[in-house]
């Protein structure tokens, strides 16, 4: 079946970073509107965008209830125009999304270096623990709260005067590295979930260099 003069949605795509999750689709509506529903494999369908002309729908509120569940969405198409002229239009067209498991698939957002502190020939580099929209007991969890030891950070660091990079890894949000006394270093970090098969790495953080405001230096 289906509805006269409507086009089924297509290219249903999940866009998700740090669990902020949007479903996008095509086409831009011409004389039609959409309703989006989301469900877990075992749950009821829940409407999130009802009779909308948008071609995206924010499903974050639903997926953060259990980020380890697998979700499916569907987009229904209806004819637009004057409401009273459409009446009962029969079964609407709909298209299913790909399945989406937030814990395994959400993109890791670009991390930020919160601070670095030099004490002699050691530098402590701290990565900001970004807040997500996942809640527990009415508080928002951080990325580390959600992923625990599944999440590691890779630090890239190099002398300001050269291009040779060194790396360090941590399963906390802090690095303690050895540096040469009297040398300035630059740092960049990347979030990684080694156990994943897709979306394993974030983009690199902005570079921060010693001798700039973020750092704190104590010569001992």
């Amino acid at each position: 079946s289906g509805t006269t003069n409507t086009v089924a949605a297509y290219n249903l795509t999940w866009k998700s970073t740090n669990f902020k999750t949007i479903l996008e689709w095509e086409p831009k509506p011409v004389n039609q509107v959409y309703t989006v529903q989301i469900s877990t494999k075992s749950g009821d369908w829940k409407s999130k965008c009802f009779y909308t002309t948008d071609t995206e729908c924010d499903l974050t509120d639903e997926i953060v209830k259990d980020v380890k569940q697998t979700y499916l969405a569907r987009v229904f198409s209806y004819p637009a125009g004057n409401v009273e002229s459409t009446g009962s239009a029969g079964e609407p067209l709909y298209e299913n999304s790909p399945e989406f498991t937030p814990y395994l698939e959400t993109n890791l957002g670009q991390p930020t270096i919160q601070s670095f502190e030099q004490v002699g020939t050691k530098v402590n580099v701290t990565v900001e623990d970004e807040r997500t929209l996942v809640r527990r007991n009415n508080t928002f969890l951080s990325l580390r709260d959600v992923f625990g030891k599944d999440l590691i950070y890779t630090l890239y660091y190099w002398k300001s005067s050269s291009s040779g990079k060194k790396t360090a890894k941590t399963n906390t949000n802090e690095f303690l590295i050895d540096v040469d006394k009297g040398e300035n270093y630059c740092f960049s970090v990347q979030a990684v979930i080694p156990s994943r098969t897709v979306n394993r790495k974030s983009t690199d953080s902005p570079v921060e260099c010693m001798g700039q405001e973020k750092g704190e230096f104590r010569e001992i």
Epitope: T35, Q37, K46, S47, F50, F76, V83, S88, P92
Partner: nanobody, 121 residues
Framework: QVQLVESGGGLVQPGGSLRLSCAAS????????IGWIRQAPGKEREGVSC????????YYAASVKGRFTINRDNAKNTVYLQMNSLKPEDTAVYYC??????????????WGQGIQVTVSS
Amino acid sequence: QVQLVESGGGLVQPGGSLRLSCAASGFTLDTYAIGWIRQAPGKEREGVSCISSTDGSTYYAASVKGRFTINRDNAKNTVYLQMNSLKPEDTAVYYCAAGPGTDCPLRFDYWGQGIQVTVSS
């Protein structure tokens, strides 16, 4: 005669409140999901709120969340939309519609004739 009839619309100042009613005659509402849909002049219709037939689960569009409340009284065969803190952009014809669905109707077996809501100072 089988129909849905909306009432409770009218002219209200910004910040004011209205309570819309959607009453069914000729059939019982309690087995249907009910949706409120509005259509502003020159715009496409927009889903505002829904309520399920079973567990009372509700849906609100982002533009009305926290301001509008939907509930149903099956004994009176009526669904209500309480609209608070109204804004000029809420001005539209409001329709109720009934159909099967877990919270919002997925097809529309019955439509009301619509009621005008105007928010203006």
